[in-house]
């Protein structure tokens, strides 16, 4: 069986300030079992944007029903975008465990923010 891939089809996305940004992510397999998390940045200081399991993410919603067992679409929408939201966002698959361990990351989607149309 082929190893799971994390696919972020958009290298970049440009959104007007005040709009919502949709960041696409799909996985190619249900195995291994474990959650998806979204991060801004790729280094040790990366910021947690969304955790499928738990947490407080008031501006983030999932595009599909990510809690369904057979779901392979982990795209998210971030509302009310501001210039401070610019950066590269990574969709990351974790392997279930104690603690969960990082399994594979998508290639990243760079979000840029345009001025609000007048």
């Amino acid at each position: 069986e082929e190893e799971l891939q994390v696919i972020q089809p958009d290298k970049s996305v440009s959104v007007a300030a005040g709009e919502s940004a949709i960041l696409h992510c799909t996985v190619t397999s249900l195995i291994p079992v474990g959650p998806i998390q979204w991060f801004r940045g790729a280094g040790p200081a990366r910021e947690l944007i969304y955790n499928q399991k738990e947490g407080h993410f008031p501006r983030v919603t999932t595009v599909s029903e990510s809690t369904k067992r057979e779901n392979m679409d982990f795209s998210i929408s971030i509302s009310n975008i501001t210039p401070a939201d610019a950066g590269t966002y990574y969709c990351v698959k974790f392997r279930k465990g104690s603690p969960d361990t990082e399994f594979k990351s998508g290639a990243g989607t760079e979000l840029s923010v345009r001025a609000k149309p007048s």
């Epitope: 991060f39 801004r40 940045g41 280094g43 040790p44 200081a45 990366r46 910021e47 947690l48 944007i49 947490g55 407080h56 993410f57 950066g87 603690p99 990082e102």
Partner: antibody, heavy 117, light 108 residues
Framework: DVQLVESGGGVVRPGESLRLSCAAS????????MTWVRQAPGKGPEWVSL???????YYADSVKGRFTISRDNSKSTLYLQMNSLRAEDTAVYYC???????????WGLGTLVTVSS | EIVLTQSPGTLSLSPGERATLSCRAS??????LAWYQQKPGQAPRLLIY???SRASGIPDRFSGSGSGTDFTLTISSLQSEDSAVYYC??????????FGGGTKVEIK
């Protein structure tokens, strides 16, 4: 408003231990990496340690094996356990929030650690 | 580890004058250089990042420039409240995160 409040500093002898705490408020603590930065008298800031959002830890070579960083997301609190303290560890220790692009955007007021015989 | 060297060590200028502070990196950091201001008894405060972007709430008399290894912080018209020590930090590489040794700005 973001607030970071350090505690636990004091005067100790070489070889002794101290545990610093940093109480955070005004942001979702669990979503951000957190760091300790120290500043010896009359010197520039020196990064000490970082704990990531997934609890992975990183240390400056000068403290590796002696200091341990940890976080309790349920209490929005950052810790630094400092063992085998040396005179050269004397400094003000700041807790600082770090951004995804490696900027120290919020700092506490600091807590003074003095190591002296 | 990237070493940051700041010059001069001290700058003594009159109110209204222009202050030019330098930071040199031991290897290229692209545009990923930040500047912090620290007043006595206070923690450092982020002023500039990405070489030239002002942090939130920072007055426009503060500006940054440079790329690669050579960077400059300019205070266009010094005010008494700008008396402080200024530090550069590279935010290109991780860890360790490194700071320069500082430049003290004194107002005559």
């Amino acid at each position: 408003d973001v607030q970071l409040v350090e505690s636990g500093g004091g005067v100790v002898r070489p070889g002794e231990s101290l545990r610093l705490s940093c109480a955070a408020s005004g942001f979702t603590f669990s979503n951000f990496a957190m760091t300790w930065v120290r500043q010896a008298p009359g010197k520039g800031p020196e990064w000490v340690s970082l704990v990531s959002v997934t609890a992975t830890t990183y240390y400056a070579d000068s403290v590796k094996g002696r200091f341990t960083i940890s976080r309790d997301n349920s209490k929005s609190t950052l810790y630094l356990q400092m063992n085998s303290l040396r005179a050269e560890d004397t400094a003000v220790y700041y807790c600082a929030k770090i951004t995804w692009n490696n900027l120290f955007d919020y700092w506490g007021l600091g807590t003074l650690v003095t190591v002296s015989s | 580890e990237i070493v940051l060297t700041q010059s001069p060590g001290t700058l003594s200028l009159s109110p209204g004058e222009r202050a030019t502070l330098s930071c040199r990196a031991s290897q290229t950091v692209g545009s990923k250089l930040a500047w912090y201001q620290q007043k006595p008894g206070q923690a450092p405060r982020l002023l500039i990042y990405d070489s030239s972007s002002r942090a939130s709430g920072i007055p426009d008399r503060f500006s940054g420039s440079g790329s690669g290894t050579d960077f400059t912080l300019t205070i266009s018209s010094l005010q008494s409240e700008d008396s402080a020590v200024y530090y550069c930090q590279q935010h290109n590489d991780w860890p360790p995160y490194t700071f320069g040794g500082g430049t003290k700005v004194e107002i005559k």
